[in-house]
Amino acid sequence: YDFTNCDFEKIKAAYLSTISKDLITYMSGTKSTEFNNTVSCSNRPHCLTEIQSLTFNPTAGCASLAKEMFAMKTKAALAIWCPGYSETQINATQAMKKRRKRKVTTNKCLEQVSQLQGLWRRFNRPLLKQQ
């Protein structure tokens, strides 16, 4: 999906008012210096691409974040403020089997959510030069 046509200001507002708090809740009890940010993004569409990937694609050691509140709010924000996003997702996953995942918070998931926090912060500051 090409995130170029999203309403970035509305997504930013959703992040600031809701998603950011849910990410903090998920990370509660974890030191902010515990994980190094290794994932970066260069502009807002790129940031949303990376955010979508880290939020919804299973990775080794972190099978699923999709049942977390921040993930659901991310998905809804993309559906509402990115034209055609939900149709793209429906078509892309039509052949895959629906399955319910157990919510398990692993250290790998915590690291992944820490990366997400960094991506969202970058999304909110699009004019900053890439480090």
């Epitope: 999709a66 049942k67 659901m72 429906i90």
Partner: nanobody
């Protein structure tokens, strides 16, 4: 599998109001459930448009086109979501669908949704 049934659609004059309901069966939502319930609409020949979402913690999102006119709410005890639609305009005419997301991984339908209810705004 969650089944969703919408009701409350109909013909209304511009400036009027309607309240849509969406009853979910096949799943009981408790105070600890994590889910999204939302509404999207589709007018003939037009792309689907998401209008609103409510989350199990009470947070809500609205599309610009309906903000200030539509209000989404949910009653966990009745497994029902509502969309109160005020100051309706002819451009609000569409089939309205209720949808639910329970955070499935690789969700085959992205969201589960109902059959829809037709809202017609015309004088």
């Amino acid at each position: 599998e969650v089944q969703l049934v919408e009701s409350g659609g109909g013909l209304v004059q511009p400036g009027g109001s309607l309240r849509l309901s969406c009853a979910a069966s096949g799943r009981t939502f408790s105070a600890h459930s994590v889910y999204t319930m939302g509404w999207f609409r589709q007018a003939p020949g037009k792309e689907r448009e998401w209008v609103s979402a409510i989350f199990s913690d009470g947070d809500t999102y609205y599309a610009d086109s309906v903000k200030g006119r539509f209000t989404i709410s949910a009653d966990n005890s009745k497994n029902t979501a509502y969309l109160q639609m005020n100051s309706l305009k002819p451009e609000d005419t569409a089939v309205y669908y209720c949808a639910i997301d329970e955070g499935m991984d690789y969700d085959g339908n992205f969201y589960d949704w109902g059959q829809g209810t037709l809202v017609t705004v015309s004088s």
